[in-house]
């Protein structure tokens, strides 16, 4: 196997962003293409950018890996053996075929793609130690990039899971970000607030438009980061909305799960006297990074009457209070550890009081309704590895406590 770590390339002029994790010539054939087309391609973050030549600054196409499903080696049509230069990238809704110049180049592309989508260095490819080292460097960069772009209240949860989370842990906040319900590149915001004595869950769409996030409200508002999106919601409600932050030591304070001997149901057991320790939630909203000039918020509206809606929901969630809901038997996912704030003294959440109120629906001036998201095949979404790995550890710890 060739030992060169990088394919030959013409260096681009300095100052061209983004600098790619990996780049080389690549021939691409999409679902609608009859033939392969040759590009200079570069991987940055979860996107492959395609350029007409390696001297171009401006990409002509890009491919988002957010709906990554798998990579497969491809034997070209009419061939009896694998020449080692073809591979396929299968996304949730399409398959793209690639052709490269060498086996090494194919393994490099596969390796870097897997590194960014699975957030781990692949171990089952034909790679040299030097290649693996490059991938471990890219892994570190990608983790750092994700940390910068993802607020702590962003969780890889679905619509109803978000609702459950906000209902069961109201003391941890009432606003979270989650992946877009329609599988697109944006995000959704789920909030839970009191209206007329009833808790109302709402979902809002945030579309990704180039480098900006556009909050889909009556007058769409543009933000340059997800932190700025959170800032918008917090500011526009006079801080009535608090980003959902679950402390990593939450379960140590709340207690642990114990199997009920009689029926096998898991029961939440609170320690009789919690000692001085971490509070269930990081108190209050995380200090948000200062908004850039593009993100300057318009003057705050007057303190909204509870009947007035400051934004247009995707659709209201059920107005159900959290009392008497089932206690979840495993810990909640936190993509990033929240930045530590000074912790208030530990306190247990108040026990449920009184009967569950009758569900009511709040439908005050909602403006235009947005369509609910589509039912699509449910495959692993990129960026889940970071969360599931952490979650698996937590689940193992919890199971150990159970036995």
């Amino acid at each position: 196997m060739a030992s060169a770590l990088r394919p030959p390339r013409v260096p681009k002029p300095k100052g061209v962003l983004p600098s790619h994790y990996y780049e080389s010539f690549l021939e691409k054939k999409g679902p609608c293409d009859r033939d392969y087309k040759k590009f200079w391609a570069g991987l940055q973050g979860l996107t492959i950018y395609f350029y007409n030549s390696n001297r171009d600054f401006q990409h002509v196409e890009k491919l988002n890996l957010g709906a990554f499903e798998k990579l497969t080696d491809e034997i070209p049509w009419g061939s009896s053996r694998d020449p080692g230069t073809h591979f396929s990238l299968i996304l949730r809704d399409q398959e793209i075929k690639f052709k490269v110049e060498t086996l090494e180049c194919r393994e490099m592309w596969k390796g870097f793609i897997l590194t960014v989508v699975e957030l781990r260095v692949p171990t089952d490819l034909t790679l040299l130690p030097g290649h693996l080292y490059m991938m471990s460097e890219v892994l570190a960069k990608e983790e750092a990039r994700r940390a910068l772009e993802t607020p702590s209240c962003f969780l890889k949860v679905s619509r109803l899971e978000a609702q459950l989370l906000l209902e069961r842990y109201p003391e941890c906040g009432n606003l979270l970000l989650r992946p877009s319900g329609d599988g697109a590149d944006g995000v959704s915001v789920t909030t839970r607030q009191m209206h007329n004595g009833t808790h109302v869950v709402r979902h809002y769409k945030v579309k990704r438009e180039g480098p900006k996030y556009v909050i889909d409200v009556e007058q769409p508002f543009s933000c340059t980061s997800l932190d700025a999106v959170v800032n918008y919601f917090v500011s526009h409600t006079k801080k009535a909305l608090v980003p959902f932050l679950l402390d990593e030591d939450y379960e140590k304070v709340l207690g642990y799960v114990e199997a009920d001997k009689e029926n096998g149901e898991n029961v939440w057991v609170a320690p009789s006297a919690p000692g001085p320790g971490p509070a269930p939630c990081t108190g209050g909203p995380k200090p948000l990074s200062p908004a850039s000039s593009q993100d300057k918020l318009p003057p705050l509206p007057p303190l909204p009457n509870q009947e007035e809606n400051y934004v247009t929901p995707i659709g209201d969630g059920p107005a159900v209070d959290y009392e008497n809901q089932d206690v979840a038997s495993s810990s909640w996912p936190v993509i990033l550890k929240p930045k530590k704030l000074p912790k208030p003294p530990a306190k247990l959440p108040k026990p449920p009081v009184g009967p569950k109120p009758e569900p009511k629906v709040f439908n005050g001036g909602l403006g235009r309704k947005l369509p609910v998201s589509s039912a699509q095949p449910l495959f692993p979404t990129a960026g889940l590895a970071d969360m599931t790995a952490e979650l698996q550890k937590k689940l193992e710890k919890r199971r150990a406590l159970e036995h």
């Epitope: 459950l164 439908n363 609910v372 979404t381």
Partner: antibody, heavy 119, light 107 residues
């Protein structure tokens, strides 16, 4: 191809226990949810319980709360329903179903497994 | 919990007919409503999600409409394979509920 295969059904006496399994293939338990739905002979569909993968949070129909426990093993791609204190009215075909994208509908279903509670 | 009421509970029709089944929710559920088809001895099959979106692979003669509390499933021209039981389901709340079903029989 997405496939769901239930097992574990059978005849059990009132008060007894049974554990149903649902082996999933063609997708991974990473994000979203799975549910158990049952259908008593000649009757309509009744949702029983759901579990969400990211958090492991669960929800139950009032009719089974405190008696049934839903769980999953992500590493085995398997969903479970532990049924305790079974009653005659729990007799039904039990289906496992996968939630579609963002919980909009149950897009894939298993073939079902029959649970009969009778003395 | 949210109650779902379907009407009619049974319906006789002929091949080629246009058929409409309605579903009413006990409270507003936005557009979080699905329709399923079930044939005897088989698992249900998702036809329509989000009130009006056709699930992939489902023939275009099936359509859904409505939002809030009132929803409709329409089969524009009945085919022999459409004789089955149809269920509506709300996914607005995580305490999912189904309608009692509408049995569509050959006249």
């Amino acid at each position: 191809e997405v496939q769901l295969l239930e097992s574990g059904g059978g005849l059990v006496q009132p008060g007894g226990s049974l554990r149903l399994s649902c082996a999933a293939s063609g997708f991974t338990f990473y994000y979203g949810g799975m549910s158990w739905v049952r259908q008593a002979p000649g009757k309509g569909l009744e949702w029983v319980s759901s579990i969400y993968y990211s958090s492991g949070s669960t929800s139950y129909a009032d009719s089974v709360k405190g008696r049934f426990t839903i769980s999953r093993d992500n590493s085995k791609n398997t969903l479970y329903l532990q049924m305790n204190s079974l009653r005659a009215e729990d007799t039904a075909v039990y289906y496992c179903a996968r939630h579609g994208w963002d919980d909009n509908g149950f897009d894939y279903w298993g073939q079902g497994t029959l649970v009969t509670v009778s003395s | 919990d949210i109650q779902m009421t379907q009407s009619p509970s049974s319906l006789s029709a002929s091949v080629g007919d246009r058929v409409t089944i309605t579903c009413r929710a006990s409270q507003s559920i936005s557009s979080y409503l699905n329709w399923y088809q079930q044939k005897p001895g088989k698992a249900p099959k998702l036809l329509i999600y989000a009130a009006s979106s056709l699930q992939s692979g489902v023939p275009s003669r099936f359509s859904g409409s409505g939002s809030g509390t009132d929803f409709t499933l329409t089969i524009s021209s009945l085919q022999p394979e459409d004789f089955a039981t149809y269920y509506c389901q709300q996914v607005y709340s995580y305490l999912f509920t189904f309608g009692q079903g509408t049995k569509l029989e050959i006249k």
